[in-house]
């Protein structure tokens, strides 16, 4: 069956060149016109680029035009896209889509890779408690969490109790600082009266800097 | 470039119920028009091509229309697997360009938010820095108003927001509010407080601490 | 949640028919939509049909149009399903299932064997 495996995303500075590959099976690949969508963060999707079965026409979004170039190599079924002076604007999910035969549809999609451009480097997350209180209680319930802030890349990984506690909780997708650096919460709501006798801690992994950090969360102490 | 207008946004449902996505182009493009389903963290996925053939696969359910400028796509009776973000796309041009996109969300019942307020820990104001979070639990609609106050005054430019995607179980969302201001600020000031605006509330809820008591 | 209770499964000639029923109770019925799927070993459940809450919305899926209808009958509280000229390969479990308002089915009827005999 039709597959198109994509790789060479990542973290990339402002001003800085990556290329991204789209490798192709299942099909004759010299006889498709491939095309490249993007979709950045919480956004919708946008079309970049397309270069005919042929190589004969190439085709490009206003936006990535003069900076992205898109190029094949039949012998090695594999698509690429070349992106030169990235901007902060370009972090997005890159996707290469196969039309169905001559329709300029999109039939077949890659899995996706994502392409962050930003100037700030690898950094693990300081975990701060998110104290339950009195001001944390309503009507037999109280909520506790962990603030996960300054870290980067994406992404973290929050578990609770080593993951035998799943039930209440919400982990929220992080937002991007002004610094350049991402910051979440988790929370979790539990019976108020478990306060004095259960233990919270919330366990954090942040994969890209090596950083594991287990937190115990617990009313504050007056 | 051929523009692609979708509407609504979003789309609040219930399984089956029959619903109608409208996709506008700013000039014709005959039948040159496709749909497709994206689930978060995937790839799209093909449902329709030339404005009504059905992508082999893809249930009955879903039905493609319109020429020129007007098209719709319509779900004749919603199952649990179509609550997600359709887009449409024009392939008449070069440029193919997409619609923005119409999210398909559950149709829940109106539930009011839990509020709760959290201060700075006294870790993080060690290092400088303090972040206070204001805490929008298990609530429906998704829209939601959270404004900050300090010792009465309405703060703005210093706050960032985060939602949860729909609850698959209550179809409810959460809400996180972050005030983050300097140590130096922080203590400058004695009452925190957020105020909350939902269709849920009869009127604002505001929760508050003053700064170093418990 | 409500409570669904589905009969009227058999064996039954190819070309032959079956009224299946899916009997409601806990919640008041005009208050959410109901489906029929249907399993064969070792494979996926399959929706077949479906109705909404004020049964004037069904959807048959393409296997089975021309062939089956859902039907809904308020007063009893109850959901049918017509099999008309049953092939050997309809033959499975059929279960009834309701979404608790919800984006999900998450209330299912216990199931009814269906057996198509050619």
């Known amino acids: 069956q039709v597959q198109l495996v994509q790789s060479g995303g990542g973290v990339v500075q402002p001003g800085r060149s990556l290329r991204l590959s789209c490798a192709a099976s299942g099909f004759t690949f010299s006889r498709y016109t491939i095309h490249w969508v993007r979709q950045a963060p919480g956004k919708g999707l946008e079309w970049v680029a397309v270069m005919s079965y042929n190589g004969n026409n190439k085709h490009y979004a206003d936006s990535v035009n003069g900076r992205f170039t898109i190029s094949r190599n039949d012998s090695k079924n594999t698509l690429y896209l070349n992106m030169n002076s990235l901007r902060p604007e370009d972090t997005a999910v890159y996707y290469c889509a196969r039309i169905r035969d001559t329709a300029m549809f999109f039939a077949h999609w890659g899995q996706g890779t994502l392409v962050t451009v930003s100037s700030a480097s690898t950094k693990g997350p300081s975990v701060f408690p998110l104290a339950p209180s009195s001001k944390s209680t309503s009507g037999g319930t109280a909520a506790l969490g962990c603030l996960v802030k300054d870290y980067f890349p994406e992404p973290v990984t929050v578990s609770w109790n080593s993951g035998a506690l799943t039930s209440g909780v919400h982990t929220f997708p992080a937002v991007l600082q002004s610094s350049g650096l991402y910051s979440l919460s988790s929370v979790v709501t539990v019976p108020s009266s478990s306060l004095g006798t259960q233990t919270y801690i919330c366990n954090v992994n942040h994969k890209p800097s090596n950083t594991k950090v287990d937190k115990k969360v617990e009313p504050k102490s007056c | 470039d051929i523009q692609m207008t979708q509407s609504p946004s979003t789309l609040s449902a219930s399984v089956g119920d029959r619903v109608t996505i409208t996709c506008r182009a700013s000039q014709s493009i005959n039948t040159w028009l496709a749909w497709y389903q994206q689930k978060p963290g995937k790839a799209p996925k093909l449902l329709m091509y030339k404005a009504s053939s059905l992508e082999s696969g893809v249930p009955s359910r879903f039905i493609g229309s319109g020429s020129g400028t007007e098209f719709t796509l319509t779900i004749s009776s919603l199952q649990p697997d179509d609550f997600a973000t359709y887009y449409c796309q024009q392939y008449n041009s070069d440029s193919k360009m997409f619609g923005q996109g119409t999210k398909v969300e559950v149709k829940g019942t109106v539930a009011a938010p839990s509020v709760f307020i959290f201060p700075p820990s006294d870790e993080q104001l060690k290092s400088g820095t303090a972040s206070v979070v204001c805490l929008l639990n298990n609530f429906y609609p998704r829209e939601a108003k959270v404004q900050w106050k300090v010792d009465n005054a309405l703060q703005s430019g210093n706050s960032q927001e985060s939602v949860t995607e729909q609850d698959s179980k209550d179809s409810t969302y959460s809400l996180s509010s972050t005030l983050t201001l300097s140590k130096a600020d922080y203590e400058k000031h004695k009452v925190y407080a957020c105020e909350v605006t939902h269709q849920g509330l009869s009127s604002p809820v505001t929760k508050s601490f003053n700064r170093g008591e418990c | 949640q409500v409570q669904l209770q589905d009969s009227g499964g058999g064996l039954v000639q190819a070309g032959g028919s079956l009224r299946l029923s899916c009997a409601a109770s806990?919640?008041?019925?005009?208050?959410?939509?109901v489906a029929w799927f249907r399993q064969v070993p070792g494979k996926e459940r399959e929706l077949v049909a479906s109705i909404n809450r004020s049964g004037d919305n069904t959807y048959i899926e393409d296997s089975v149009k021309g062939r089956f209808t859902i039907s809904t009958d308020n007063t009893k509280s109850t959901i049918y399903l017509q099999l008309n000229a049953l092939k050997p390969e309809d033959t499975a479990v059929y279960y009834c299932?309701?979404?608790?308002?919800?984006?999900?089915?998450?209330?299912w009827g216990q199931g009814t064997q269906v057996t198509v005999s050619s």
């Open positions: 806990g919640r008041t019925f005009s208050g959410y939509s």
């Open positions: 299932a309701a979404p608790y308002g919800l984006g999900r089915y998450d209330s």
